[in-house]
């Protein structure tokens, strides 16, 4: 079938392949201090690491990309590590009349894959 | 709001930023010649190019990633160019008894963004 099995063990060694990592960021880092009140610091999960051949392939396209990258590395880039899902986050932000709570669905990564 | 405006003009010069590019691939290239009969060659649209700050940001997470990459380039990778949507593709493949047409929804990229 079109779907070769994406592999889950990292051939590059521990922590080198595509995975979720927590990055601490302040409102100042994000440029949000003028409109967000809370939280003052965000634990941002982000996708980092390399995508060796067929590691955590997002889909058939990613598998093809991995294969063609092996054949034509100058023309076809390797798949890269991006979020596969997100954790919703609530921000408390200023409004014209006061404060409001708003949920953001695409702010913090929950899982990663190679696309 | 959390969404800064993703920009669409490439600051790196024509063809350098994240875009869709066609790559010709044979069934042999893909390792599919034993089970796919048609097409013998696929025009594969793939996402290639760089993702400079806020260029075609997929979502808020990608905008945060771009900003934090500017602050901590060793810790946070730049966003990378991945498919935002796909064009369905029909493959004619061998079955035990003959041939069958099957649609694959995630094989050829139709659009790209920076995630």
């Amino acid at each position: 079938s079109a779907h070769a099995h994406p592999r889950d063990s990292c051939p590059l060694g521990p922590g080198r392949c595509c995975h979720l990592e927590t990055v601490q960021a302040t409102l100042e880092d994000l440029g949000w201090s003028d409109w967000v009140l809370s939280p003052r610091q965000l634990q941002l999960s982000m996708c980092v690491g390399e995508c060796p051949h067929l590691y955590r392939s997002a889909n058939t396209h990613a598998q093809i990309k991995a294969r063609l990258h092996g054949l034509q590395p100058d023309k076809v880039p390797a798949p890269c590590c991006v979020p596969s899902s997100y954790t919703p986050v609530v921000l408390m932000h200023r409004t014209d009349s006061g404060v409001s709570l708003q949920t953001y669905d695409d702010l913090v990564a929950r899982g990663c894959h190679c696309a | 709001s959390a969404h800064a405006h993703p920009r669409d003009s490439c600051p790196l010069g024509p063809g350098r930023c994240c875009h869709l590019e066609t790559v010709q691939a044979t069934l042999e290239d893909l390792g599919w010649s034993d089970w796919v009969l048609s097409p013998r060659q696929l025009q594969l649209s793939m996402c290639v190019g760089e993702c400079p700050h806020l260029y075609r940001s997929a979502n808020t997470h990608a905008q945060i990633k771009a900003r934090l990459h500017g602050l901590q380039p060793d810790k946070v990778p730049a966003p990378c160019c991945v498919p935002s949507s796909y064009t369905p593709v029909v493959l004619m493949h061998r079955t035990d008894s003959g041939v069958s047409l099957q649609t694959y929804d995630d094989l050829v990229a139709r659009g790209c963004h920076c995630a």
Partner: antibody
Amino acid sequence: QVTLKESGPGILQPSQTLSLTCSFSGFSLSTYGIGVGWIRQPSGKGLEWLAHIWWNNNKYFNTALKSRLTISKDTSNNQVFLKIASVDTADSATYYCARMGYDIMDYWGQGTSVTVSS
Amino acid sequence: DIVMTQSHKFMSTSVGDRVSITCKASQDVNTAVAWYQQKPGQSPKFLIYSSSYRYTGVPDRFTGSGSGTDFTFTISSVQAEDLAVYYCQQHYSTPWTFGGGTKLEIK
């Protein structure tokens, strides 16, 4: 479930233009590798391929009829159109449309009967 | 254009018999020949692709063979419901062309 249905004028006069519509469901003409073809069959005779149009808008025509044929598609409304200019009695036939996956015509409509008569 | 010739317009057979229908191409078409079945009052049904590949759901009593210019479609054990006209069609190059058809009659 794939279905195709042809519609046409039924009867028309010589020298007029025949306009046929193929309305389909169960597949999309924006899918790579998919096309829709037209085939006709005069009463009691064999099949004659007329034209087909692909997902990427590439078009192919029967050599003998090419100058009289126009094929087009409306992808969003799942329709394909065939026009035959300057018809005469020899164009009387049942007209079929068929879904194509590469060079397979795997699903056919029920056909629409066209009579050219003065 | 490639001309496809089915030399027999009619073939008569009995239920349970094996029957073969032939088709000849005017030039080499490799294995690019399809076969269709058209029952009375119905639209054609796709059976065989690229000379020998049965399409999904087609009973295994239907087989095809051949390459180059000579092709054969075989029903290993004819059933009453196989009464139909059978057409070959080349898909080697456009314009696609059909044979004239062979009508299978059940004795």
